[in-house]
């Protein structure tokens, strides 16, 4: 560590003292086997080369072994997310060994100094794993390293240094500063384990990106585009804190990766699915809801190993809290013609009616201009499971692109008071469910009346041919 008074410096000073005056030095990296869900329970400390604690603490050599690796800390104490993750792992994998890697002395530094300590911590974990491998029945393939923020890169170093290949590394919003664009040996990368899956929840193209933006695993999942997480806006944190500040927003969004992973452990019956896409904008347009050729996957603990993929970017929308799952739909709306539209840009709203429930009125986010005489694709998502869709209500409003256009519209209206109303002609809506992969076409309830003015509604019902499931669609994940 470059800091002259960092813990490593202290350690070196201690070791150079004569034996008689050496004080007891706490190791910079400790391995705490959590034997209980109770955060107050101290657990057992494993010690390299000492087999007794393994036996005393009931370390199960044949079971899965999780290593939880925290990140940089300003407080120098374990944060609440760690206890939640320990508890969730114990709940899901009752026989597993859950080891917390405590590198607080090396992480409780200036961020930049903590970064420079990641390599040595990764090396310590690798040495522990090498020693465990000498034991009968212990398999590196059963090891799952889970690293949050800076801890994700520590996991990368551990996977790189260990003799053999770790089964899995999960990076929970791996840290960005000093790692973005770095060489693969100096950050988490797909080479560090048999399967590396990553959740990115705080990436920014402006300001400082606390989470790494670049893909660093076999699959890289970007919930809500990997940037603005629902429930983490300043207004949201203002409601729950004495002072809502940017740091609270940062913490909320950065830590969201951990909570998404915890959710995947405890809400097994409500898995969230992510869909492969080249970028966030294409996903927002609803283009990427395919499960063909391994293009979709569960997120978090339930993610399926896709070793053939590298740096595969996947996207999904989520709720603001647990359970995070939403239901994604692709909507294709063919706008046949505009009538007296001028410079007005339409904003569509849909309400979906299903066998289980009805949605709220949902705005269709416009990523690009709506094209006339063309099929426009949108992404919508609902927080509740609607079941099979029965009908859709569509409305639209005109949103002017600029004050100048608004003035032009007003002038045009005033000069031609008998100007017929603006209208759009929409005859059908094609819908695809991301979660079920089902495709359906909805036709206008009245085929003779498919024009719609602002504020008016148009109803669409399932076309007579009913549900159409494409034969080639065979989801590679267990879809509900």
């Amino acid at each position: 560590s470059p800091t002259p008074f960092g813990p490593e410096g202290q350690l070196a000073d201690e070791l150079h003292k004569p034996k008689a005056i050496q004080t007891e030095v706490k190791p910079s990296v400790r391995f705490n086997l959590r034997t209980s869900k109770d955060p107050e329970h101290e657990g057992c400390y494993l010690s390299l080369g000492h087999s007794q604690p393994l036996e005393d603490c009931g370390f199960n050599m044949t079971a899965k072994t999780f290593f939880i690796i925290h990140g940089w800390t300003m407080s120098g104490i374990f944060e609440n997310w760690l206890h939640k993750l320990v508890s969730a792992l114990h709940t899901r994998e009752k026989d597993a060994n859950v080891v917390v890697v405590d590198w607080l002395p090396l992480a409780h530094q200036l961020y930049t100094d903590a970064v420079n300590n990641t390599r040595v911590v990764g090396h310590s974990i690798a040495r522990m794993l090498d020693w465990l491998q000498e034991k009968d029945d212990f398999s590196l393939g059963n090891v799952h390293l889970i690293g949050y923020s800076l801890g994700a890169h520590v996991a990368g170093y551990a996977g790189n240094f260990v003799k053999g290949t770790v089964g899995r590394i999960t990076g929970l919003d791996p840290a960005g500063p000093m790692f973005e664009g770095a060489d693969i040996h100096k950050r988490l990368s797909p080479d560090d384990a048999d399967f590396v899956d990553v959740l990115h929840t705080y990436t920014r193209s402006f300001g400082l990106s606390i989470g790494i933006q670049m893909p660093v695993g076999h699959i890289d999942i970007y919930p809500n585009g990997g940037d603005f997480q629902p429930g983490c806006g300043l207004n949201d944190v203002l409601g729950s804190m004495a002072y809502g500040t940017i740091t609270e927003v940062v913490k909320c969004e950065h830590e969201r990766a951990v909570h998404l992973f915890v959710d995947s452990l405890v809400n097994q019956d409500k898995p969230s699915f992510a869909f492969q896409c080249t970028d966030s904008n294409r996903f927002k347009k609803g283009i990427c809801l395919s499960c063909r050729k391994n293009r979709c996957n569960s997120i978090g603990y339930n993610a399926k190993k896709m070793r053939n993929k590298r740096n595969s970017k996947m996207y999904l929308k989520t709720r603001a809290g647990m359970p995070f799952r939403v239901y994604h739909y692709q909507m294709k709306i063919h706008v046949f013609s505009y009538k007296n539209m001028g410079e007005i840009e339409p904003t569509f709203y849909v309400t979906l009616y299903g066998t289980n429930a009805d949605s709220q009125t949902l705005p269709l986010e416009i990523v690009e201009r709506i094209e006339q005489n063309a099929t426009n694709t949108f992404l919508v998502y609902t927080e509740e499971d609607l079941g099979d869709l029965l009908k859709i209500q569509l409305t639209w409003e005109g949103a002017s692109q600029s004050w100048y256009n608004l003035w032009k519209e007003l002038r045009s209206y005033l000069s031609q008071p008998h100007n017929p109303g603006r209208e759009l002609n929409i005859r059908r809506i094609r819908v695809k469910s991301g979660e079920t992969q089902r495709k359906l076409t909805f036709c206008a309830e009245d085929p003779e009346n498919t024009s719609i003015s602002p504020g008016r509604e148009l109803w669409f019902r399932k076309c007579r041919d009913g549900w159409r499931m494409k034969n080639e669609t065979s989801p590679t994940v267990e879809l509900p």
């Epitope: 300003m74 409780h108 200036l110 100094d113």
Partner: antibody, heavy 119, light 107 residues
Framework: QVQLQQSGAELVKPGASVRLSCKAS????????IHWVKQRSGQGLEWIGW????????KYNEKFKDKATLTADKSSRTVYMELSRLTSEDSAVYFC????????????WGQGTLVTVSA | DIQMTQTTSSLSASLGDRVTISCRAS??????LNWYQQQPDGTVKLLIY???RLHSGVPSRFSGSGSGTDYSLTISNLEQEDIATYFC?????????FGGGTNLEIK
């Protein structure tokens, strides 16, 4: 909004001690580190050290570790810096400032406290 | 300790000018370079953090660039209120260190 209010100017005798205060408002006090910076007349800035109220964590610049002592009172949301064994070299304006995590920058500054050491 | 050097201690420019202030670190500081403005009344403000990111509320005429050991602050269209002293600071490792400052004056 974030504010750091520093105590008033001090005139002290050589060899004496002085305690400067920095009262924070407009944010969660325990979540941010407060730094102290020295500026001698017409000169540059020197980093003295930091105090993190969340865990009472302190770091000093080696140069100031026998000169400055940082403490805090969470109830009044105030960080203190005591300067001891004062000499004319300690005559300066002392600023407190709030640390921004990850960027390692000082985003908000107090107005400064002038300390004059004179017999 | 990392030494921060601002070679120009004083700079004269006209209103509307494009002004560049440079800062050099004695070793690579991985973009952990911040710029501060100290106004004549002593008030200190953060302008740029992490080499090029504009702090909230800072006018867009201020910009920062650089990497490794060499960094610069540019004011694209000098205004009267920009007359101040500018300091660079490295946040890469402790102890944090500042440049000696560049005093900007009107010609």
């Amino acid at each position: 909004q974030v504010q750091l209010q520093q105590s008033g100017a001090e005139l002290v005798k050589p060899g004496a001690s002085v305690r400067l205060s920095c009262k924070a408002s407009g944010y969660t006090f325990t979540k941010y580190t407060i730094h102290w910076v020295k500026q001698r007349s017409g000169q540059g800035l020197e980093w003295i050290g930091w105090f993190y109220p969340g865990s009472d964590s302190i770091k000093y610049n080696e140069k100031f570790k026998d000169k400055a002592t940082l403490t805090a009172d969470k109830s009044s949301r105030t960080v203190y810096m005591e300067l001891s064994r004062l000499t004319s070299e300690d005559s300066a304006v002392y600023f407190c400032a709030r640390h921004e995590e990850y960027t390692n920058s000082l985003a908000y500054w107090g107005q400064g406290t002038l300390v004059t050491v004179s017999a | 300790d990392i030494q921060m050097t601002q070679t120009t201690s004083s700079l004269s420019a006209s209103l509307g000018d494009r002004v560049t202030i440079s800062c050099r670190a004695s070793q690579d500081i991985s973009n952990y370079l911040n710029w501060y403005q100290q106004q004549p009344d002593g008030t200190v403000k953060l302008l740029i953090y992490y080499t090029s990111r504009l702090h909230s509320g800072v006018p867009s005429r201020f910009s920062g660039s650089g990497s490794g050991t060499d960094y610069s602050l540019t004011i694209s269209n000098l205004e009267q209120e920009d007359i101040a002293t500018y300091f660079c600071q490295q946040g890469y490792t402790l102890p944090w260190t500042f440049g000696g400052g560049t005093n900007l004056e009107i010609k």
